[in-house]
Amino acid sequence: EEGLQVIQPDKSVSVAAGESAILHCTATSLIPVGPIQWFRGAGPGRELIYNQKEGHFPRVTTVSDLTKRNNMDFSIRIGNITPADAGTYYCVKFRKGSPDDVEFKSGAGTELSVRAKPS
């Protein structure tokens, strides 16, 4: 279980304003059981972007179908990018816990930069 890695293959991604950004993330194992979450930024002030376990995030769709029981691709697509979306995004694996899930392992992060909309 300690061998699980969260892989974010892209160090950086550049997207034009108004376009969609795809942020790639894969896990190397189904173990331990627990959800994936995406955050912008690190530390206590980080912003939740997507939570596999809870809620609906209208601007975010998963690239693959997470309801498939053997899925290990947790890449997301964020629609209608604006300059305010720039930052470093982390794909974080949580281990199922009681009462709360516990952060288990984070990807290295992907820096999203936003280019001006082509005129």
Partner: antibody
Framework: QVQLVESGGGVVQPGRSLRLSCAAS????????MIWVRQAPGKGLEWVAS????????YYADSVKGRFTISRDNSKNRLYLQMNSLRAEDTAVYYC?????????????WGQGTMVTVSS | DTQLTQSPSSLSASVGQRVTITCGAS??????MHWYQQKPGKQPKLLIY???NLEAGVPSRFSGSGSGTDFTLTISSLQPEDFATYYC?????????FGQGTKLEIK
């Protein structure tokens, strides 16, 4: 084995209130989102409300928004539906169901339902 | 809201027959379409999740296909216990919506 047992249904006058309960057993309740779905006599299924595993995310159908409140008590393995200002069109069998993880998952187990009749 | 339209609304068929029920969505739901079976006086039962995945314990004569806006539930060889009402349901975005149901009756 997974069990969901609804209770609290009955006959109630328009404008009054009723509280439904769903007792869950056979699985880790706090891992699952929960849903209320209703079915009027002779009609199809209508989603009413859903609540995420930690109660952080709650959604309602427009037809019940402002009148119904979904809640849960993970320490008691119970789901609730508080129904206020009841109308004749709320008459239905109310089912609770569970949903693993996030919004996109299906409802894999359902209770047997409890009947609510709103009539003067 | 995403509207779901099932076709046909009712269907008469014989044991052993192959039956297909379709569900059309008013906008793309990706693959987040699920199918349920309901018998009179009973709660719904999940058959197929995410368009094409057979729920555990469901006989292999049931199958599902589709993505985007067009989905199909197929029963390859009807058995007596399959006569029931079938519903599609999307979970791509709130609010969750169901199709109006397809009642499958014995011919």
């Amino acid at each position: 084995q997974v069990q969901l047992v609804e209770s609290g249904g009955g006959v109630v006058q328009p404008g009054r209130s009723l509280r439904l309960s769903c007792a869950a057993s056979g699985f880790t309740f706090s891992d699952y989102g929960m849903i209320w779905v209703r079915q009027a006599p002779g009609k199809g299924l209508e989603w009413v409300a859903s609540i995420s595993s930690s109660s952080s995310y709650i959604y309602y159908a427009d037809s019940v928004k402002g009148r119904f409140t979904i809640s849960r008590d993970n320490s008691k393995n119970r789901l609730y539906l508080q129904m206020n200002s009841l109308r004749a069109e709320d008459t239905a069998v109310y089912y609770c169901a569970r949903r693993y993880y996030g919004f996109n998952y299906p409802f894999d187990y359902w209770g047997q339902g409890t009947m609510v009749t709103v009539s003067s | 809201d995403t509207q779901l339209t099932q076709s046909p609304s009712s269907l008469s068929a014989s044991v052993g027959q192959r039956v297909t029920i379709t569900c059309g969505a008013s906008k793309s739901v990706r693959t987040y379409m699920h199918w349920y079976q309901q018998k009179p006086g009973k709660q719904p039962k999940l058959l197929i999740y995410s368009a094409s995945n057979l729920e555990a314990g469901v006989p292999s004569r049931f199958s599902g296909s589709g993505s985007g806006t067009d989905f199909t539930l197929t029963i390859s060889s009807l058995q007596p216990e399959d006569f029931a009402t079938y519903y599609c349901q999307q979970s791509n975005e709130p609010p969750y919506t169901f199709g109006q149901g397809t009642k499958l009756e014995i011919k």
